[in-house]
């Protein structure tokens, strides 16, 4: 095969698969290339596009057994092992800054196979629930990514605000008031891709009382302390990648 034909084939895409992949912050992530044996390959390239940074490429050329990097500064993003043994890419201790697009390009003599990942870093919000006025409770999901969703049982007269932080996290604050006096206990349910959490509080008829469900004060209980229930894993709560073929 002449050099011209090889060059032409480099731009021919034989198969492309793109996957959205939510990953919990502080976990390790392994991103995989298409299932093609090394014997069929000429070059393996990982292309990494992170927000506000120049595109980073990590390439391995089989013929010369050499690796090359361009514009790659994050030392936590590396080949899993020697690329001639394993072409996967690993991110050690995923951070918010790892949000972005990662693509493995496998160059064969007949064209390219692409496998792309839209990596969405998930941050578990800190949840608090307290009473700040008579028959009014405030539930906060602080610094989650993406924004959490807050619902109440029973439903009240609620106002929800979102506060966006520069690091990409969002604080959601829901303030609810219950006029109906037979409502004594209210539950705040926080839904998030990393899992769900519920806290409940007894509405105390004390004007100006500011009681916290996490404070363990009189008549206040955190469901999770009382029943030892932890975050229920949601669809995005997996530490390992599930491939879609």
């Amino acid at each position: 095969m002449d050099e011209k034909q090889i060059t032409q084939n480099y731009s021919k895409v034989l198969a492309e698969v793109n996957t959205s992949w939510p990953v919990k912050m502080a976990t390790n992530a392994v991103l995989c290339c298409p299932p093609i044996a090394l014997r069929n390959l000429i070059i393996i390239t990982w292309e990494i596009i992170l927000r506000g940074q120049p595109s980073c490429t990590k390439a391995y050329k089989k013929e010369t057994n050499e690796t090359k990097e361009t514009n790659c500064t994050d030392e936590r993003i590396t080949w899993v092992s020697r690329p001639d043994q394993n072409s996967d890419l690993q991110i050690r201790t995923v951070a918010i800054t790892h949000d972005g697009y990662y693509r493995c390009i496998m160059v064969t003599p007949d064209g390219n196979f692409h496998r792309g990942y839209h990596l969405q870093v998930l941050v578990t919000p800190e949840v608090t629930l307290f009473q700040n006025r008579n028959r009014t409770a405030v539930c906060k999901a602080v610094a989650g990514k993406p924004a959490a969703h807050i619902s109440w049982i029973p439903e009240g007269d609620c106002a929800t605000k979102q506060e966006y932080w520069s690091n990409g996290t969002v604080t959601v604050k829901s303030t609810c008031h219950w006029e109906v006096h037979n409502v004594s206990t209210v539950t705040c349910h926080v839904s998030h891709l990393t899992g769900n959490k519920s806290l409940y509080i007894e509405l105390l008829p004390v004007p100006g009382a500011k009681k916290s469900a996490k404070g363990g004060g009189s008549g206040l209980n955190d469901i999770f302390e009382a029943q030892k229930i932890e975050w229920h894993e949601g669809s995005g709560g997996h530490h390992h990648h599930h491939h879609h073929h």
Epitope: A37, R39, D110, H241
Partner: antibody, heavy 119, light 110 residues
């Protein structure tokens, strides 16, 4: 249409050599790895080795190292498997098979060549 | 080398039956999120024909009554409703670094 056409049946004496050919058509011959597999009567399929015509890389099953030689003629789009020092237990149908990239699977096979080793 | 053990080695079944063939690898054939296990059908005097690749993917042109499942070391080929043309020998095969075939399962008419 991808096709792999193998040479005809052979009868050989013990100690002799045999060379089986596999002519490829319908695709760029140098772009795909060619495997050789054999099947003795009533036995499981057995891997002999492979050749990558793109760079002439070869790899052999330990069992056939030193006895099997895989070559290719790019101009003729043909792969060859030569087996020397033949024994009666080498009596088998020999297949060439093109390895498809995705998943390293064999979609295309030659029709098979029966090699009989008998004194 | 990875050894593949198929069971049963032969079975008798009738048209319309559900048939299950298993293949056990001596060590895991799953890596990088993929299971490098394929299934082939072979009829006398013919080369093998690919049915399933990467454990569960149906090869183009293969009837949907064929399906594959499994990961790690244990894999299954299922024929949901056996047809007259399905009486043949079936092989599992692994091909990541080295190529290995199972011993085969012959599906015969009851």
């Amino acid at each position: 249409e991808v096709q792999l056409v193998q040479s005809g049946a052979e009868v050989k004496k013990p100690g002799a050599s045999v060379k089986v050919s596999c002519k490829a058509s319908g695709y760029t011959f140098t772009s795909y790895v060619m495997f050789w597999v054999r099947q003795a009567p009533g036995q499981r399929l057995e891997w002999i080795g492979y050749i990558n015509p793109y760079n002439d890389d070869t790899k052999y099953n330990e069992k056939f190292k030193g006895r099997a030689t895989l070559t290719s003629d790019k101009s003729a789009s043909t792969a060859y498997m030569e087996l020397s020092s033949l024994r009666s237990e080498d009596t088998a149908v020999y297949y060439c098979a093109r390895e498809d990239y995705y998943g390293s699977r064999f979609v295309y096979w030659g029709q098979g060549t029966l090699v009989t080793v008998s004194s | 080398d990875i050894q593949l053990t198929q069971s049963p080695s032969s079975l008798s079944a009738s048209v319309g039956d559900r048939v299950t063939i298993t293949c056990r690898a001596s060590k895991s054939v799953s890596t990088s999120g993929y299971s490098y296990m394929h299934w082939y059908q072979q009829k006398p005097g013919k080369p093998p024909k690919l049915l399933i690749y990467l454990a569960s993917n149906l090869e183009s042109g293969v009837p949907s009554r064929f399906s594959g499942s499994g990961s790690g070391t244990d894999f299954t080929l299922t024929i949901s409703s056996l047809q007259p043309e399905d009486f043949a020998t079936y092989y599992c095969q692994h091909n990541r670094e080295l190529l290995t075939f199972g011993g085969g399962t012959k599906v015969e008419i009851k």
